[in-house]
């Protein structure tokens, strides 16, 4: 491993569509990919009138975006679904929103999904 | 590296079924996301279920609803697609293939296919 | 279900040329969109995951983009073993559902 990478090997996993797709609602998904590639965890969700709705979590596969990102944290301003990763385990556990604007002070939405959990 | 090799082509009668397997070679099968996909002669690809052997349960096409049963048996790295009440329009090459991840980022491992011919 | 779109069904390029092939979704899919090659006789290959993201092995003349609703593949530089059928594929909801497909022919 290169000195100061975190490596993901597993990150939370959730399903908003758990019944509709029979799998598990929420769990730990180990995460795989070639050994030059890096992997990530990442968090999806939607802002319906101030109400946070996870849509998926669970791992994401060598993406530039997401490197050496220790937060899940979103910077786009207002998205229709709300996108994050991170590298290390279980680090889309916390997520947040903290849009990056030109001209007023960025403001951070810190989200925490309450999913239930179950190892 | 994870493989997946398929059972041999079949024909089949109208009203009969067909099981079709999947061997994985590889690490860890009970952690995959497999996904059965098929392609009818010079048509498009069609999903048609998929199954996370470590959950056991698999979701289905509401197409093939109440037809087809996705099936895993960890012990011996194998996953099975049977698809009942054959008709002619069945007639076509079913694959198998892994998942990227539980969220299913991308195909990227796909077995050789499985040719089932439906006819009289 | 979600249906998915392709423009255009098929369309002719010389060797060197740069193509794009551009998918819709009917609904949004956020990023869950790949994108796949077929040739005759063969199973299909992933080239792209994550709307934009370049599968292990996949050349770098390969490219995705997009998000939502609206998608492109993007192709420089034609070599002539990119010939061939390509698909897009939303896996955001399901049934996962395939765009018809472009065929990408010499001219």
């Known amino acids: 491993a290169i000195l100061g990478r975190s490596e993901t090997q597993e990150c939370l996993f959730f399903n908003a569509n758990w019944e509709k797709d029979r799998t598990n609602q929420t769990g730990v998904e180990p995460c795989y990919g070639d050994k030059d590639k890096r992997r990530h965890c990442f968090a999806t969700w939607k802002n319906i009138s101030g109400s946070i709705e996870i849509v998926k979590q669970g791992c994401w596969l060598d993406d530039i975006n997401c490197y050496d990102r220790t937060d899940c944290v979103e910077k786009k301003d207002s998205p229709e679904v709300y996108f994050c990763c991170c590298e290390g385990n279980m680090c889309n556990e916390k997520f947040s929103y903290f849009p990056e604007m030109e001209v007023t002070q960025p403001t951070s939405n810190p989200v925490t999904p309450k999913p239930p959990y179950y190892n | 590296q994870v493989q997946l090799v398929q059972s041999g082509a079949e024909v089949k009668k109208p009203g009969s079924s067909v099981k079709v397997s999947c061997k994985a070679s590889g690490p860890r099968f009970q952690d995959l996301s497999i996904s059965w996909v098929r392609q009818a002669p010079g048509q498009g690809l069609e999903w048609m279920g998929g199954?996370?052997?470590?959950?056991?349960?698999?979701n289905y096409a509401q197409k093939f609803q109440g037809r087809v049963t996705i099936t895993a048996d960890e012990s011996t790295s194998t996953a099975y697609m049977e698809l009942s009440s054959l008709r002619s329009e069945d007639t076509a090459v079913y694959y198998c293939?892994?998942?990227?991840?539980?969220?299913?980022?991308?195909?990227?491992?796909w077995g050789q296919g499985t040719m089932v011919t439906v006819s009289s | 279900e979600i249906v998915m779109t392709q423009s255009p069904s098929s369309l002719s390029a010389s060797v060197g040329d740069t193509v794009t092939i551009t998918c819709r979704a009917s609904?949004?899919?956020?990023?869950?969109l790949a994108w796949y090659q077929q040739k005759p006789g063969k199973a299909p290959r992933l080239l792209i995951y994550?709307?934009?993201q370049l599968h292990s092995g996949v050349p770098s003349r390969f490219s995705g983009s997009g998000s939502g609703t609206h998608f492109t593949l993007t192709i420089s530089s034609l070599q002539p073993e990119d010939f061939a059928t390509y698909f897009c594929?939303?896996?955001?909801?399901?049934?996962?559902?395939f765009g018809p497909g472009t065929k990408l022919e010499i001219k």
């Open positions: 199954i996370i052997p470590i959950y056991g349960t698999a």
């Open positions: 994550g709307a934009g």
């Open positions: 609904q949004g899919v956020s990023r869950w």
């Open positions: 594929q939303q896996s955001y909801s399901t049934p996962f559902t």
């Open positions: 293939v892994k998942d990227l991840t539980w969220t299913n980022l991308g195909l990227d491992i």
